[in-house]
């Protein structure tokens, strides 16, 4: 009796299953009690000897390429051996590499977690993923794994992490890069500082008082609110960052506490109050302000 090994599919792609069947064309396996064993090169596969003429391999990999055969043994210990069959496992080169971010859109707040997710649409086997910072490409990390995606994490983002990033994937057919992704690090405003600026050391009624509010840190645009005794005077903005000013034509009622508030949508911060007092110098007829 002759024995044949049939592999289905005969040219598997990496990661796909294969069924090995040990066939005896001129003999029904039910006619006698047979035990079957499958081999690759010199090594027995799966459970070793078994009553089933089939062996299911869940996933084939490039390193599983080799020479396969099977053996059948009767109860009388007669051993039949099939001819060797060459099984070549086909590797799919990586293609369509993309880089995505979590949070999406590449905008992340300072101190928050950023994940750069490198994905391939196609590709089998061990894929090496590499992450790079900047268009020139400072290598951040590499990971080799059997999956179509891999992650690089920055647990707490800093201002210096605002850059362009890209990733590269490769599985033996040469590197395949993703496109560039820009990361914007949004920085909440710091506590602003309020300064009062007058045209002279002792400002008088009808002088123009400039209230200048500035948060030294914070992503633009920044909106500033100006207050006198907790009453809103109005708002001004700093489209490119920095400070903003609000002008007041002084009257006697403008004596008192002034403050400002900064917000860029990531959190408001209020300045310390600055006090403006009217003083009437001896022999002077007009009121003066001091701060």
């Amino acid at each position: 009796a002759e024995l044949f090994l049939i592999a289905s599919p005969s040219h598997p792609t990496e990661g796909s299953p294969v069924t090995l069947t040990c066939k005896m064309p001129f003999l029904q396996s039910s006619d006698a009690q047979f035990q079957f064993c499958f081999f690759r090169d010199t090594r027995a596969l799966g459970p070793g000897w078994s009553s089933s003429p089939k062996l299911q391999i869940a996933a084939m990999w490039k390193e599983d390429t080799g020479s396969y055969w099977c053996e059948a043994q009767t109860m009388a210990s007669k051993v039949l051996r099939s001819r060797r069959s060459q099984i070549n496992v086909h590797r799919v080169p990586v293609a369509d590499v993309s880089l995505e971010t979590q949070p999406p859109g590449g905008q992340v707040m300072e101190g928050d977690r950023l994940v750069l997710i490198c994905s391939v649409a196609m590709g089998t086997g061990d894929i090496t993923f590499l992450w790079y910072k900047g268009a020139v490409g400072l290598n951040l990390q590499s990971k080799t794994q059997r999956s179509l995606t891999a992650e690089y994490e920055i647990p707490s983002v800093r201002e210096s992490d605002a850059e362009q990033y890209y990733c590269v994937a490769e599985n033996g057919y040469g590197p395949s890069p993703s496109g560039l992704v820009s990361i914007t690090v949004r920085i909440p405003v710091s506590r602003p500082i309020l300064m009062l600026r007058a045209p002279r050391a002792q400002a008088a009624v009808e002088d123009v008082l400039e209230l200048h509010c500035e948060a030294l840190r914070g992503s633009p645009p920044i909106l500033y609110w100006f207050y006198h005794e907790d009453i809103t005077l109005g708002s001004r903005s700093a489209p490119s960052g920095g400070g903003a000013s609000f002008n007041l034509s002084l009257t006697e009622e403008h004596s008192g506490n002034y403050s400002c508030e900064a917000n860029n949508g990531l959190g408001a911060q209020r300045s310390e109050a600055v006090t403006l007092n009217f003083t009437v110098p001896t022999g002077a007829r007009s009121n003066h302000l001091t701060s």
Partner: antibody, heavy 116, light 108 residues
Framework: QVQVVESGGGVVQPGRSLRLSCAAS????????MHWVRQAPGKGLEWVAG????????YYADSVKGRFTISRDNSKNTLYLQMNSLRAEDTAVYYC?????????WGQGTLVTVSS | EIVLTQSPATLSLSPGERATLSCRAS??????LAWYQQKPGQAPRLLIY???NRATGIPARFSGSGSGTDFTLTISSLEPEDFAVYYC??????????FGQGTKVEIK
């Protein structure tokens, strides 16, 4: 005294457009941000759109982004809301509110009904 | 987006009783939370701003407290005109400027 008065509401068919106006008086309009807030019948308040004192920055709720446009004319002390591609779910009373930076003054509202 | 959750949805009380309304933020809004009162057919009215400051013309029976994520509006002794819907709103992080879903204070 501070006053904001909305106008321009009415009944409109789905897919059509409407422009709301908000006339402000009693304060220096060009010093304050302005917002539109809506309230569907029997529901809570929903912020719709906001604009900075000088019109330089505009913000929209996701539900209206790409369909509504907020604008202002500081020379006329007027705030606008251009509403395009209206849907049944846009049916609401639309309020305009002054930002100080709290919403300290509100208009009486104008009813927009989107119905075929 | 910061989500504001108000509780309870409805508060049934009698005039003269104390009302305690809660507003919880999904993340810190510092002290930048306001409370509004709305009566049927009327526009909302600013009651409390920056968590604890009474707006102009608001009676002393209204008080606000809290910071971070947990805020409370207290009406020490309910007057007949206080029966209304109350909303909290944050202005710390935007867009969007968000409101709570409201608490209705009704006569028991």
């Amino acid at each position: 005294q501070v006053q904001v008065v909305e106008s321009g509401g009415g009944v409109v068919q789905p897919g059509r457009s409407l422009r709301l106006s908000c006339a402000a008086s009693g304060f220096t309009f060009s010093n304050y941000g302005m917002h539109w807030v809506r309230q569907a019948p029997g529901k809570g308040l929903e912020w719709v759109a906001g604009i900075w004192y000088d019109g330089s920055n505009k913000y929209y709720a996701d539900s209206v982004k790409g369909r509504f446009t907020i604008s202002r004319d500081n020379s006329k002390n007027t705030l606008y809301l251009q509403m395009n591609s209206l849907r049944a779910e846009d049916t609401a009373v639309y309020y305009c509110a002054r930002e100080s930076p709290n919403f300290d003054y509100w208009g009486q509202g104008t009813l927009v009904t989107v119905s075929s | 987006e910061i989500v504001l959750t108000q509780s309870p949805a409805t508060l049934s009380l009698s005039p003269g009783e104390r009302a305690t309304l809660s507003c919880r933020a999904s993340q810190s809004v510092s002290s930048y939370l306001a409370w509004y009162q709305q009566k049927p057919g009327q526009a909302p009215r600013l009651l409390i701003y920056d968590a604890s400051n009474r707006a102009t013309g608001i009676p002393a029976r209204f008080s606000g407290s809290g910071s971070g994520t947990d805020f409370t509006l207290t009406i020490s002794s309910l007057e007949p005109e206080d029966f209304a819907v109350y909303y909290c709103q944050q202005r710390n992080n935007w867009p969007p400027w968000t409101f709570g879903q409201g608490t209705k204070v009704e006569i028991k």
